[in-house]
């Protein structure tokens, strides 16, 4: 499917002191959706500032956000999910800045979980598996996953593999023997919905065997 912006591109804000960005999460709490917005400048004095969303809503014209420390948050079933909503920063009744946003283009999936790695001695490979709550969802079901792994001593030398399933095989010969590895995974919408990368899953650590050394399941460290 063609799109206009790369996945992960933030909506650009108006050039003023109240620039903000938002992300949506669909069916994040049962059938409830959420929308989270925050100012891009952490030094903005948010004391009297409120957020409001209007348009592309079911049964209501507008909804107000709740303030949770530095973020603004809505949890609701009332997103129409078609058409553009107008999200405004307000002081009282006055709008300081607004953005037209289609909530289906700013979706941030939930982080994958239960990441694990199993060594298969006979096949000389590692089977990486993980889980995602999106397998049970009705809207954002199709994701692209980014599995990243590195040798623990190579701080910034991550190898990335993109896949659409929740299972990946790493060949032993592609990894250093007797080395400690860190692996993690994140997800991004991949069919119709667009948006941002999820948070990373918790990292999993595993050690590769010595050459010709047999080993069973990789134990987490």
């Amino acid at each position: 499917e063609s799109g206009y912006a790369q996945n992960g591109d933030l909506e650009d804000a108006e050039l003023d002191d109240y620039s903000f960005s938002c992300y949506s999460q669909l069916e994040v709490n049962g059938s409830q959706h959420s929308l989270t917005c925050a100012f891009e400048d952490p030094d903005v004095n948010i004391t009297n500032l409120e957020f409001e969303i209007c348009g592309a809503l079911v049964e209501v014209k507008c909804l107000n956000f709740r303030k949770l420390q530095e973020i603004y948050f809505i949890e609701t079933k009332k997103f129409l999910l078609i058409g553009k909503s107008n999200i405004c920063v307000k002081v009282g009744e006055k709008s300081l800045t607004c953005k037209k946003i289609d909530l289906t283009t700013i979706v941030k999936p939930e982080a994958p979980f239960d990441l694990s790695v199993v060594y298969r001695e006979g096949a000389n490979d590692f089977v990486v598996t993980f889980n995602t709550s999106h397998l049970q969802k009705k809207y954002v079901k199709v994701l692209m996953h980014d599995v990243a792994y590195r040798q623990e001593k190579d701080e910034n030398k991550w190898t990335h593999v993109n896949l659409s399933s929740t299972k990946l095989t790493l060949l032993q010969r592609k990894l250093q023997p007797a080395a400690m590895y860190e692996i993690k995974v994140r997800s991004i919408p991949d069919h119709y919905f667009k948006g941002f990368w999820s948070e990373w899953s918790p990292s999993y650590y595993f050690r590769t065997p010595e050459i010709n050394n047999s080993s069973g399941e990789m134990d987490p460290i």
Epitope: E1, L81, I82, K84, K100, T104, K138, Y139, Y192
Partner: antibody, heavy 118, light 111 residues
Framework: QVQLVQSGAEVKKPGASVKVSCKAS????????LHWVRQAPGQGLEWMGG????????AYNQKFKGKVTLTSDRSTSTVYMELSSLRSEDTAVYYC???????????WGQGTTVTVSS | DIVLTQSPASLAVSPGQRATITCRTS??????????MHWYQQKPGQPPKLLIY???NLESGVPARFSGSGSETDFTLTINPVEAEDTANYYC?????????FGGGTKVEIK
């Protein structure tokens, strides 16, 4: 009020190019993507492609890739559609249309007739 | 490409009666309750006009005698009651997958 005003009718020879403009008014230009839809004489509607005036990013119907180039000018709130290597089959009314959501068209220009004839 | 088949190709309706147009798609254009089907009216010499978006949402300013329904691969546009000014061509359009395709159109005439 929200309006899309297109440039006037064009008559072109086969092999030539044509550039049709669509000027938006009555709303913030960068808030909505603009698309082009063509309608050959007595025929139905065919989506050609769209452009996001905010980023300049484009999306094309594969059928029209290489044939159509979409551009936008934020300073004048105008989008352009250039058709190259014109053939008689390109004779049609070309509409620009605003995308109210993904991807339906809530505001339409009046249409520009392009006639390709030797 | 997703193919949209409209039926009937044309119909004649008396004022005050109901007109029903169907649009069938070659694959589903729904994601759960999000139905990516839209309807337009086009009168001779004019651009199309959006009537219904998301299968059943009435566009602002469109008379309530127009309504839409359906999901997955089968959608319906209903005009009830039909008025003389509803003489036009009607098109369905899907937006789940590029290229965004239209149906072949249904010509509605008022008897």
């Amino acid at each position: 009020q929200v309006q899309l005003v297109q440039s006037g009718a064009e008559v072109k020879k086969p092999g030539a190019s044509v550039k049709v403009s669509c000027k938006a008014s009555g709303y913030r230009f960068t808030d909505y993507e603009l698309h082009w839809v063509r309608q050959a004489p007595g025929q139905g509607l065919e989506w050609m492609g769209g452009i996001d005036p905010k980023t300049g990013g484009t999306a094309y119907n594969q059928k029209f890739k290489g044939k159509v180039t979409l551009t936008s000018d934020r300073s004048t709130s105008t989008v352009y559609m250039e058709l190259s290597s014109l053939r008689s089959e390109d004779t049609a009314v070309y509409y620009c249309a605003r995308s109210g959501g993904r991807w339906y068209f809530d505001v339409w220009g009046q249409g520009t007739t392009v006639t390709v004839s030797s | 490409d997703i193919v949209l088949t409209q039926s009937p190709a044309s119909l004649a309706v008396s004022p005050g009666q109901r007109a029903t147009i169907t649009c069938r798609t070659s694959e589903s254009v729904s994601i759960h309750l999000l139905h990516l089907m839209h309807w337009y009216q086009q009168k001779p010499g004019q651009p199309p006009k959006l009537l219904i978006y998301g299968a059943s949402n009435l566009e602002s300013g469109v008379p309530a005698r127009f309504s839409g329904s359906g999901s997955e691969t089968d959608f319906t546009l209903t005009i009830n009651p039909v008025e003389a000014e509803d003489t036009a061509n009607y098109y369905c359009q899907q937006s789940i997958k590029d290229p965004y395709t239209f149906g072949g159109g249904t010509k509605v005439e008022i008897k």
